[in-house]
């Protein structure tokens, strides 16, 4: 679709005659008819195929022609087709007489013709104005003419529709071929699709708008390149969506169940050994001067009753000293003056004489001991209770008092709250420090795993082209993993090719 | 070549909200190439564009509509959905979904069959 | 809001030509497609981007569009023409549907 323009510039007929050679009277009110047709080798009367326009009069025998265009006149004149411009035409341009006001070709007598002027040519679409005179014996006619494309049609043909748009189906100028040139940030084959944030992951992020990343399910990032992890992972990562791969010393289906409490709270105090000994519980060696469960409590050296055979302690600055009685001496009144003669076991102990009665030895009844059986057995010395257990002497024996979860002789054993097998539906129990959890096979949930829900997502295969499908449990839903090359939800579109469609 | 199915309640009081979905069959919904439109039409009258939204969840509404609907996607079904609150007898239309497509200029060369949705106690 | 004015009903005698209007303000410079509805049925795509016909819509249905002014012309029109059309545009991110035109073949 197009338009011919046609610029009548100046007409001389200097003589004010017809084409017969009769005068007009009292002047030749001159107005013009335009045949523009199809291209003849010989100009040739017949339909005015390309279309036809006629002037008001213009001027009287000799005048200019003003260009009105500007002001939406009638020059230059305006001969719009609706067809591929064929590059070649003929024009016929006639000058005719108006004696009166009625300018239709059935009004005027044959005879009012002034001049008719044929040409034939070829023409290319273009804003150039080609300028062209016509000369006969009594008339001269100065004119230009050109052919331009109608507004949204380009091309060499004026051929190509092409609108500028800025919506969602499409972002595009028009180039003066009619191709179509993309706005910033916009691409495809129709502009419509945005060119994401740069370095936007192909597969797991997308955009709506130029410069945007927005993550698909199980994504996040600026750039939608890091998983997100199961909900509820505590100290755990993913290297897929929903993961939860525990950090080291931790355990559990979300990473919360602290299997090194040793280096994640050191509770062990005054530089004792610690040692993790199950989830949540660890054991305290204290050195040498210390006691409690996590070796908070100071000994006075003398709380280990270091002097023998009833010698008295006493706490020094630098250790401690023991003030021995009679008939013992030594750092610890370990050595004795005494014989068996002199009944020096206590509490029932027997004596016997050793080195030809120089010297003695006490064996002691249960529960007593000592050189000389003077001390009563404490059965809490070596700290037999594991687990942080509180040791009592009760008599000749001795018991622990376990802390909360843990049971047996020596604390050792841990309460498992899994004996009762209180998980649903084959589901496997794990205990936990306050209580349990219930890790659910598929197709249920709850605490117990009484609820039953719906199957894996996943179950029936939904992604193309050998991804990796995972199951979304907070929606029951699937996220298709790609592999490089494969993009879409399913993964069935191969990258950097148009999707083809079976319809 | 591909069809459009709608389905939903024939019948939605008034004040609560009337919920259509468009299953897409022979072909997928995840293209760059189309977008998926709602078009009403209340009975002897003419058609009214609702809204549209691509396979990615870009969304666009009629702006006389847009307080009251959201046009959701579910590409692992092939469906795209339509949701409008508050209706009044005045939402009483056949509603439409459509393929738009792209190389049209937008022009819907896929239509759904219909469903007549009235809002009525 | 946009708007798209076509007039209510063409009538139109078989073999003769219908040409129905559809204006809005800077029309031309906006893609117009076409729908015909037949009673009971769902709307069909006749013209899409002005004038060109999608695969299967007969050569008598044509369509242009210039100024504030789109048409959608019928040469030869048949009684199985008889329905209504509707003018379609884009204006900005929202689709626009003129009110419809009834053509009825005498």
């Known amino acids: 679709s197009g338009v011919f323009q046609l610029q009548l510039q100046e007409f001389i007929n200097e003589r004010g005659v017809l084409a017969s050679g009769r005068p007009c009277e009292p002047g030749c009110r001159t107005f013009f008819r335009v045949c523009l047709k199809h291209f003849q080798a010989v100009v040739s009367p017949g339909p005015c195929t390309f279309g036809t326009v006629s002037t008001p009069v213009l001027g009287t025998n000799s005048f200019a022609v003003r260009d009105d265009s500007s002001g939406g006149g009638r020059n230059p004149l305006q001969l719009p087709f609706n067809f591929t411009w064929p590059g070649t035409f003929s024009l016929i341009i006639e000058a005719w007489h108006a004696p009166g006001d009625d300018l239709r070709p059935e009004a005027l007598p044959p005879d009012a013709l002034i001049s008719k002027i044929a040409i034939q040519g070829s023409l290319a679409v273009g804003q150039n104005w080609l300028l062209d005179e016509q000369t006969s014996t009594l008339t001269r006619l100065r004119y230009s003419y050109r052919v331009i494309c109608s507004d949204n049609y380009y091309g060499d043909n004026c051929s190509r529709l092409c609108k500028k748009r800025n919506d969602h189906f499409g972002h595009y100028v028009c180039q003066p071929d009619g191709n179509l040139s993309c706005l910033p940030g916009w691409t495809g084959e129709y502009c419509q699709q945005p060119i994401c944030l740069s370095g936007c992951h192909e597969q797991n992020g997308y955009c709506s708008k130029p410069a945007e990343c927005l993550c698909r399910p199980g994504w996040q990032g600026r750039l939608c390149n890091e998983c997100i992890p199961h909900n509820g992972c505590r100290h755990g990562t993913c290297s897929t969506p929903w993961q939860c791969t525990c950090d080291e010393g931790w355990g559990g289906l979300f990473c919360d169940q602290d299997l090194n409490y040793c280096t994640h709270h050191s509770p062990c105090k005054n530089g004792a050994t610690c040692s993790n000994s199950g989830q949540r519980s660890y054991t305290c060696t204290c050195r040498p001067g210390y006691t409690g469960v996590d070796c908070e409590l100071e000994l006075s050296e003398c709380d280990s009753n270091p002097c023998r055979n009833g010698g008295s302690c006493k706490d020094q600055e630098d250790g401690y000293h023991c003030l021995c009685p009679p008939g013992y001496y030594g750092l610890h009144c370990e050595h004795s003056t005494l014989s068996c003669a002199d009944s020096p076991c206590f509490n029932g102990g027997s004596c016997r004489e050793r080195n030809q009665g120089a010297n003695y030895a006490c064996e002691c009844p249960p529960n007593f001991t000592g050189s000389n059986c003077e001390k009563k057995v404490d059965r809490c010395t070596s700290n037999p209770c594991a687990n942080g257990g509180q040791c009592l002497n009760r008599g000749p024996s001795r018991m622990c008092r376990c802390r909360p979860g843990f049971t047996g002789t020596y604390c050792e054993l841990h309460v498992s709250d899994c004996a009762r097998n209180p998980c649903a539906h084959g589901g496997t129990c794990h205990d936990l420090e306050n209580g349990l959890m219930c890790t659910c096979p598929a197709g249920f949930s709850g605490r117990r795993c009484e609820v039953r829900t719906s199957i894996d997502a996943c179950a029936s295969s939904p992604c193309f082209n050998r991804a990796t499908c995972y199951t979304d449990l907070s929606t029951d839903t699937f996220v298709c993993n790609c592999p490089y090359g494969f993009v879409g939800s399913r993964c069935e579109f191969p990258v950097g090719l148009p999707p083809s469609f079976p319809w | 070549e591909v069809q459009l199915q709608e389905s939903g309640p024939g019948l939605v009081k008034p004040s609560e909200t009337l919920s259509l979905t468009c299953t897409v069959s022979?072909?997928?919904?995840?293209?760059?190439?189309?977008?998926w439109g709602w078009i009403r039409q209340p009975p002897g009258k003419g058609l009214e564009w609702i809204g549209d939204i691509n396979y990615n969840g870009n969304t666009y509404y009629n702006p006389s509509l847009k307080s009251r609907v959201t046009i959701s996607v579910d590409t692992s079904k092939n469906q795209f959905s339509l949701k409008l609150s508050s209706v009044t007898a005045a939402d009483t239309a056949v509603y439409y979904c459509?393929?738009?497509?792209?190389?049209?200029?937008?022009?819907?060369?896929?239509w759904g069959q219909g469903t007549l949705v009235t809002v009525s106690s | 809001s946009y708007e798209l004015t076509q007039p209510p009903s063409v009538s139109v005698s078989p073999g003769q030509t219908a040409s129905i209007t559809c204006s809005g303000e800077?029309?031309?410079?906006?893609?117009v497609s076409w729908y015909q509805q037949k009673p009971g049925q769902s709307p069909v795509l006749v013209i899409y981007?002005?004038?060109t016909r999608p695969s299967g819509i007969p050569e008598r249905f044509s369509g242009s569009n210039s100024g504030d002014t789109a048409t959608l012309t019928i040469s030869g029109t048949q009684p199985m023409d008889e329905a209504d059309y509707y003018c379609q545009a884009w204006d900005s991110e929202t689709g626009v549907f003129g009110s419809g035109t009834k053509v009825t073949v005498l």
């Open positions: 459509a393929r738009e497509a792209v190389a049209l200029g937008g022009g819907a060369d896929d």
């Open positions: 022979g072909g997928s919904i995840s293209s760059s190439n189309y977008y």
């Open positions: 800077g029309l031309g410079d906006k893609y």
């Open positions: 981007e002005d004038s």
